[in-house]
């Protein structure tokens, strides 16, 4: 299962950690996709490492763990974020986070 804070807030110009926690006794995580609405933010793959989409590469840092640190937040970053955990043999698990960026 995926466990996450469903709603988080942060100040404009600040940073925030987007984190989904996957727990399973048997399944192994093979890939994690992070999206902002429908736009790819980053991918982690056991076989490839981290890839951060070019448009976010100056503001998104992988980690901690399989999460993301989103820096230099703007009001436009307010919205839904989705993590998708690809696991073997467990299948695919999804989590949702709503980020509210507040004026500083």
């Amino acid at each position: 299962t995926i466990d996450t804070k469903r709603n988080i807030s942060a100040e404009e110009g600040g940073s925030v950690i987007l984190q989904c926690h996957f727990s399973s006794d048997t399944a192994e995580v093979t890939q994690v996709d992070w999206k902002q609405q429908d736009q790819l933010l980053a991918i982690y793959s056991v076989d490839l490492g981290w890839h951060v989409a070019s448009v976010f590469s100056d503001r998104v840092v992988p980690g901690p763990s399989l999460g993301l640190t989103f820096q230099s937040l703007t009001m436009n970053d307010t919205g839904e974020y989705f993590c998708t955990y690809h696991t073997y043999p467990g299948g695919i698990y999804k989590g949702r986070i709503f980020l509210k960026v507040q004026e500083s």
């Epitope: 991918i43 056991v46 490839l48 981290w50 890839h51």
Partner: antibody, heavy 119, light 107 residues
């Protein structure tokens, strides 16, 4: 024997297209991520692109993004690189390569196929 | 993208010498570093992955160490067949990137 054999290289004018192929044998091709890496004459190695085992995802170096397309046909054990809008700086020896699972390192390479972009 | 800086760019050595090549990453990459050997007209050959794991079939005179940003490839006793160019490669981030290469030449 695990083997990768590239083909399709040649001399092409700037702005034109070329499609490279990489025939795989000796391993379960459809279970592996596959990569293209290139090497300009007398220069170092540059990673170009990767494709997921089932072809569901593809990622590219910024230098080729929007111009090159990696694809695969698992029924034919073949990897492809479609190269459009070629530039002089794309002149290189192009290798396909297979990784050691989970190691993020490339243990089997083809012999390479040379692409020369020149007017 | 992560930059990898190899040093030296070339080294002259004799058979039996101990040779050390370093690779420095522009940011931390944990232990996600591989080393390759390339001879003229040939494809690269994987020597080391995961910074220190010896690839199957590679002689034990090759060893790798390091983590974070600083890595080393050591050839404990150089053999005639070891004269070649050596590249490091990081795989913490895509795009994977390679160092500029170190040419090991005969003194």
């Amino acid at each position: 024997e695990v083997q990768l054999v590239e083909s399709g290289g040649g001399v092409v004018q700037p702005g034109r297209s070329l499609r490279l192929s990489c025939a795989a044998s000796g391993f379960t091709f459809g279970s592996y991520y596959m990569h293209w890496v290139r090497q300009a004459p007398g220069k170092g190695l540059e990673w170009v692109a990767v494709i997921w085992p089932d072809g569901s995802n593809k990622l590219y170096a910024d230098s080729v993004k929007g111009r090159f397309t990696i694809s695969r046909d698992n029924s034919k054990n073949t990897l492809y690189l479609q190269m459009n809008s070629l530039r002089a700086e794309d002149t290189a020896l192009y290798y396909c390569a297979k990784p050691v699972p989970k190691s993020r390192a490339l243990d089997v390479w083809g012999q390479g196929t040379m692409v020369t972009v020149s007017s | 993208d992560i930059q990898l800086t190899q040093s030296p760019s070339s080294v002259s050595a004799s058979v039996g010498d101990r040779v050390t090549i370093t690779c420095r990453a522009s940011q931390g990459i944990s232990s996600w570093l591989a080393w390759y050997q390339q001879k003229p007209g040939k494809a690269p050959k994987l020597l080391i992955y995961g910074a220190s794991s010896l690839q199957s079939g590679v002689p034990s005179r090759f060893s790798g160490s390091g983590s974070g940003t600083d890595f080393t490839l050591t050839i404990s006793s150089l053999q005639p067949e070891d004269f070649a160019t050596y590249y490091c490669q990081q795989a913490f981030y895509l795009p994977w990137t390679f160092g500029g290469g170190t040419k090991v030449e005969i003194k």
